[in-house]
């Protein structure tokens, strides 16, 4: 008789999850010489230890502490790019602007990007059938707690001018419930961070509105100002041109507003 298994509302662990994490770790440490000292087997052991045999609705930031510690790395604190609901463009940008970093350009972010994982209480099995959904099941699930933990640490490390890319096509350009709005904004350190600069990315080609005047951006400005951090905002009207100009800043068409 098959053992009863908890059925969650979200998709199960990504297939070949252990192999994927280990392979990504090896690849990352090969590409980044400053991380060559990292023992990827230990990183996997720490990752696994955070959720295996634990109830997937009862995960804490402390569970991830060994992984956070083993995966700590040096990122230039003044070269951090945060993003909200516009991951692909943010990643395209840092692929071109190699001296800037999103969370997914760090080892820990790279390991977990686009993956899902969870275990089961009191068994060493990984659950490939289903995992808790943040809304429908519980917020303290392995994936959500992981991203909350790494996002907090990433924001805490930031200094000087921090950039954030926001999606101007969404009804809430700044969403207080996003990871950026609920975690990163509140963990920027006012004694280290001078300015948060928002880049609002326009979706429509003919969209010439000043989205920096959007009520949700004003809300973000208010939150940031109350934390004694300056705020600035730029419209990126043509994201395609924006990326092109990052690649080729000498191009004559790149002097006009993008």
């Amino acid at each position: 008789v098959p053992r009863w298994r908890q059925q969650w509302s979200g998709p199960g662990t990504t297939k070949r999850f252990p192999e994927t994490v280990l392979a990504r770790c090896v690849k990352y440490t090969e590409i980044h010489p400053e991380m060559r000292h990292v023992d990827c087997q230990s990183v996997w052991d720490a990752f696994k230890g955070a959720f295996i045999s634990k109830h997937p609705c009862n995960i804490t930031e402390e569970d991830y502490q060994p992984l956070m510690k083993l995966g700590t790395q040096t990122v230039p604190c003044n070269k951090i790019l945060l993003w909200s609901r516009i991951k692909d463009l943010a990643h395209q940008f840092t692929q071109v602007q190699r001296d800037m970093f999103t969370l997914e350009d760090t080892l820990l972010g790279y390991l977990a990007d686009d993956l899902t994982w969870c275990g089961e209480f009191n068994t060493s099995k990984i659950n490939y059938q289903s995992c808790p959904d943040w809304r429908k099941d519980c917020s303290n699930n392995p994936v959500s707690v992981f991203w909350k933990t790494v996002s907090r640490r990433f924001a805490e490390a930031a200094c000087d001018v921090v950039h954030v890319m926001l999606n101007g096509s969404r009804s809430k350009i700044f969403d207080k419930n996003s990871t950026f709005g609920s975690v990163e904004v509140h963990n920027l350190q006012p004694e280290k961070v001078q300015t948060l600069e928002a880049w609002v990315i326009h979706g429509g080609r003919e969209d010439s509105r000043d989205l920096c005047q959007d009520p949700t951006i004003k809300e973000l400005e208010s939150i940031i100002s109350k934390r004694n951090i300056q705020f600035s905002c730029k419209n990126i009207y043509r994201p395609d041109k924006f990326l092109q100009c990052v690649k080729n800043p000498e191009d004559s068409s790149c002097t006009s507003e993008i």
Epitope: D45, G49, P66
Partner: antibody, heavy 117, light 107 residues
Amino acid sequence: QVQLVQSGAEVKKPGSSVKVSCKASGYTFTNHWIEWVRQAPGQGLEWMGDIFPGGGYTDYNEKFKGRVTITADESTSTAYMELSSLRSEDTAVYYCARGRDLAMDYWGQGTLVTVSS
Amino acid sequence: DIQMTQSPSSLSASVGDRVTITCEASQNINVWLGWYQQKPGKAPKLLIYKASNLHTGVPSRFSGSGSGTDFTLTISSLQPEDFATYYCQQGQSYPYTFGQGTKVEIK
């Protein structure tokens, strides 16, 4: 080879502060955590806190929160541990050590701090 | 805080003896356990990390085992230079904590 060399012994008055240094060599200073551990005379080992010099991340034992500050100077590959509001119970040998797989693989020679009026 | 309990607190043994020291954690620490040797007036030295991995330069007579809450350090054939105090340490969660030590003395 990996080496951690600590500053010399100190005698301090109660209420004052002490700053112990730990100069690292033989490895990339910014890539590894530096741990601070103390040992009172005839007693066991007690973890105080740590720092990741490359990112300035620090973690402290709650027992010492507010009294201990750990810093690092990348340019000289030196970590520092400052303990304030000293009392006689702080008399101990203070060690720095390099972190490795959540253990401590290389240790400094220790710095004896004596707190006495 | 995670409590680390070592036993015995001291033992007497002869050169050539097999010596076993145990360390019990008050909660699951997975494999994040280190073993150290300390001699009087000297800094501790790492013997074993991650429960069972021998640190560089440490003689193979030292071995470690265990995971979860119960761990063992074994010296297969005690040598004169092994008379010292041994400590275990957990790295699973802050604050890192050490066992109270096991003093290995000459019988």
